[in-house]
């Protein structure tokens, strides 16, 4: 019979002939020939190959290197590789999460205005006039200058963006 | 063992479009991002794209307008375009290992020469 | 734009010295800064990852330092194959992944 050229899915072509692919999870050992099989083996422990292949090596699973902030989210099988993802307080430095980066702060002056996620980064702004912020902190909000009034004090330093007003006793008419 | 090799033309004339290709083996690109980063002789490293292991593009905002950056995970190629070359063009073009990270794997680089 | 600026672009020292790079962010970057090795003719070899992180199979007398938009590589005794160029670069985000200009260590 003449030799195929092309193969069904899950074959592949070699030596003019159409031979088995190995299910994820296995790598080829050897082709197939006119009389055998195609011969696959396990992938070996933190190794995996996940589609249907003629690789020779499987791939090793991914690591989760602490030193980029990442961590096991999922452990990986023979057919699956291991998925990582950010440590708490820190974010993906882009979709695929390949690495992590610690959550910025808000330098004292500015706020958060929407705490970080695992995948996005805080998100800060300048404390308006009557709002305070004196930490660096990827947490707190601007704070509002304290209401000297409804303490029944006065103001006798002004506030900053960066620092309270500082209330003082209202001066008293001496008799 | 994981590997990264880069291909394509060693010379090529200005106004053209340059194509690289970068062959991984050892890994998977379902798993693992890929960067071209270049290197123009005698001066500093380029970062210039990256495809994330989830197929997102990334591109430096200098060269964004003629760079495309594509994969194929059956093929194990990543492929870099850059059009409308210039004689500044002239580098070794590296692909590396990873999109948006660090790159401990690198491959050995191709020097790629623009001239008429 | 985003950039890195290391400084000094060459420096010439001897061995046994201890050297120092500094390498400075346009917006901070967190601690998302990693440091290269390069000699002529090879790609960069990765050195220091997470700003301050030892990449495997780095001798210890390398260390980085910094956070934010401030970062330093020392070299704690310079060894004869540390004679090279020193790169930081910055993968805080997709607009901020950027190489530094370079710092040659020539010997002295």
């Known amino acids: 019979p003449e030799p195929p050229t092309a193969c069904r899915e899950k074959q592949y072509l070699i030596n003019s002939q159409c031979c088995s692919l190995c299910q994820p999870g296995q790598k080829l050992v050897s082709d197939c020939t006119e009389f055998t099989e195609t011969e696959c083996l396990p992938c070996g422990e933190s190794e995996f190959l996940d589609t249907w292949n003629r690789e020779t090596h499987c791939h090793q699973h991914k690591y989760c290197d602490p030193n980029l902030g990442l961590r096991v989210q999922q452990k990986g099988t023979s057919e699956t590789d291991t998925i990582c993802t950010c440590e708490e307080g820190w974010h993906c430095t882009s979709e695929a999460c390949e690495s992590c980066v610690l959550h910025r702060s808000c330098s004292p002056g500015f706020g958060v205005k929407q705490i970080a996620t695992g995948v996005s980064d805080t998100i800060c702004e300048p404390c308006p006039v009557g709002f305070f912020s004196n930490v660096s902190s990827a947490f707190e909000k601007c704070h509002p200058w304290t209401s000297c009034e409804t303490k029944d004090l006065v103001v006798q330093q002004a506030g900053t963006n960066k620092t309270d007003v500082v209330c003082g006793p209202q001066d008293r008419l001496r008799a | 063992e994981v590997t990264l090799k880069e291909s394509g033309p060693v010379l090529v004339k200005p106004t053209e479009t340059l194509t690289l290709t970068c062959t991984v083996s050892g890994f998977s690109l379902s798993s693992y991002g890929v960067s071209w980063i270049r290197q123009p002789p005698g001066k500093a490293l380029e970062w210039l794209a990256g495809?994330?292991?989830?197929?997102?593009?990334y591109y430096a905002s200098w060269a964004k307008s003629r760079l495309t950056i594509s994969r194929d995970t059956n093929l194990k190629q990543v492929v870099l375009t850059m059009t409308n070359m210039d004689p500044v063009d002239t580098a070794t073009y590296y692909c590396?290992?990873?999109?948006?990270?660090?790159?401990?794997?690198w491959g050995q680089g191709t020097l790629v020469t623009v001239s008429s | 734009a985003f950039q890195l600026t290391q400084s000094p672009s060459s420096l010439s020292a001897s061995v046994g010295d201890r050297v120092t790079i500094t390498c400075q962010a346009s917006q901070s970057i967190s601690q998302g800064l990693a440091w290269y090795q390069q000699k002529p003719g090879k790609p960069p070899k990765l050195l220091i990852v997470g700003a301050s992180n030892l990449a495997s199979g780095v001798p210890s007398r390398f260390s980085g330092s910094g956070s934010g938009t401030d970062f330093t590589l020392t070299i704690s005794s310079l060894q004869p194959e540390d004679f090279a160029t020193y790169y930081c670069q910055s993968y805080f985000s997709s607009s901020s992944t950027v190489f530094g200009g370079g710092t040659k260590v020539e010997i002295k």
């Open positions: 495809i994330g292991s989830d197929g997102s593009a």
């Open positions: 590396a290992r990873g999109g948006i990270t660090v790159y401990a794997m």
